[in-house]
């Protein structure tokens, strides 16, 4: 409608690291001689429309989220109404939205994408002593409470990927953080070096791993 | 259970204004967004407007800007559309729907709730 | 101006199922335009089936399902009954105002 209420948010996804703050940006154009009294602000889930904080009635309501939003209350006379949302978990990730009302009403979403970075994959041998070639082995890739679910990629020491005899499994913990385990199946060379990466798709991360099979002994690369 | 109920039949001359009345019963209209939807005979439905009666805020479809209004009495639960220089093809069933602000339940129904109905006939 | 399309007619047999789907002019349906499915019967007033794309109004039977395929709003009736002859109307949400589409209506042989 004319003269609606533009309220404005980022196109493209908030990403936050899960225990970090994030700021839902949110801004409208306050008209000439706009006072706060004449505000009405709800942030909510988009999907359910539960309330998640308020101002109304001239006065900031609080948080109805676990008490872990603020808004920005010395902007919000210039029309910014952007929420901050703190020690993100992954149970946030989604769509708020920002509805704000004064003479008329619009409203607007933003995605929340949730993120946390894998750990140094750690790789194991099986069986790990009195190898020879010809034997087969299984190594374990496993990399810990990261978000979302990872891609993995294997590949040998030349850099030829290895995609066969691959089996990955993700599983979420209470936190809903993912701990990733890819196994690799190969027949031993005469030597061999062996390389995981776990990738995080947000973040654009990647965490490697590798181990190196020279006949006997074995010796795994030193910690970075 | 809230139930909107709607204002009677209508019969007016083109030029003039007519205002239909919604009222809840068994419930509030906060904080609800309280629609106005029409329906010409043989067409589909149509929205006029709304208005968040916990506000007094509305907004209107850009077709009739300038010639609804779209108004709200918090004290008796009453949300009213008026519709002025009326002419022919405003011959319509007028309705009022309930639509949630924010769901109180944690469930968005949408557009659970509706008026009876109001015709309003525009003939001279 | 914003349009909707909605199939003008569609047929089914009782006990069947149907899918009746909503395009939007401004490109993909999602969550944040909140799609309603709005019955209506002859002499009676319209009735709300679905809202926020997939929940069931109070009342509403459970062969009614509200989804997001392809981009569009669709509303699937599993088991489709007699009664369920109708036309079906989906409304979006746009920021600031409702729109609604044109209308399916079902018949049902």
């Known amino acids: 409608p004319t003269g609606a209420v533009e309220v404005q948010v980022p196109e493209d996804p908030v990403v936050a690291l899960v225990g970090t703050d994030a700021t839902l940006r949110c801004s409208f154009s306050p008209e000439p001689g706009f006072s706060l009294a004449q505000l009405n602000l709800i942030w909510q889930l988009t999907d359910t429309k539960q309330l998640v904080h308020s101002f109304t009635e001239g006065r900031d309501q609080g948080s109805a989220y676990a008490n872990r939003t603020a808004l920005f209350p010395d902007l919000l006379a210039q029309g910014n109404a952007s929420l901050r949302l703190q020690r993100v978990r992954v149970a946030d990730e989604g769509s708020f939205t920002c509805f704000v009302s004064i003479r008329d009403f619009g409203s607007a979403a933003v995605s929340l994408q949730v993120a946390a970075p894998y750990s140094k994959p750690s790789m194991t041998l099986e069986p790990n002593k009195d190898l020879r070639p010809g034997d087969t082995v299984t190594i374990t890739c496993s990399s810990y409470r990261g978000y979302p679910e990872a891609e993995v990629f294997w590949q040998d020491g030349q850099g030829v990927p290895l995609t066969g005899n691959v089996t990955t499994s993700q599983m979420a913990n209470e936190q809903g953080l993912f701990d990733v385990h890819s196994v690799l199946r190969v027949v031993l060379g005469a030597n061999g070096t062996y390389s995981c990466l776990v990738r995080n798709p947000v973040l654009q991360q990647d965490a490697h791993g590798s181990v190196t099979i020279t006949g006997q002994p074995m010796t795994f690369p030193p910690e970075a | 259970q809230v139930q909107l109920v709607q204002s009677g039949a209508e019969v007016k001359k083109p030029g003039s204004s007519v205002k239909v009345s919604c009222k809840a019963s068994g419930g509030t209209l906060r904080p609800v967004l309280i629609n106005w939807v029409r329906q010409a005979p043989g067409q589909g439905l149509e929205w006029m407007g709304g208005i968040i009666p916990l506000f007094g805020t509305a907004n209107y479809a850009q077709k009739f800007q300038g010639r609804v209004t779209i108004t709200a009495d918090e004290s008796t639960s009453t949300a009213y559309m008026e519709l002025s220089s009326l002419r022919s093809d405003d011959t319509a069933v007028y309705y009022c729907?309930?639509?949630?602000?924010?769901?109180?339940?944690?469930?968005?129904?949408?557009?659970?709730?509706w008026g009876q109905g109001t015709t309003v006939t525009v003939s001279s | 101006d914003i349009q909707m399309t909605q199939e003008p007619s569609l047929t089914t047999s009782p006990g069947g199922t149907v899918t009746l789907t909503c395009r939007s002019s401004?490109?993909?349906?999602?969550?944040?335009?909140?799609a309603n499915w709005v019955q209506e019967k002859p002499g009676q007033a319209p009735r709300g089936l679905i809202g926020g794309t997939n929940k069931r109004a109070p009342g509403t039977p459970a062969r009614f399902s509200g989804s997001l395929i392809g981009g569009k709003a669709a509303l699937t009736i599993t088991g489709v009954q007699p009664e369920d002859e109708a036309i079906y109307f989906c409304a979006l949400w746009y920021s600031n105002l409702w729109v609604f589409g044109g209308g399916t209506k079902l018949e049902i042989k």
């Open positions: 729907a309930r639509d949630q602000v924010v769901a109180t339940s944690g469930v968005n129904f949408g557009m659970d709730v």
């Open positions: 401004t490109g993909a349906v999602t969550t944040s335009n909140y």
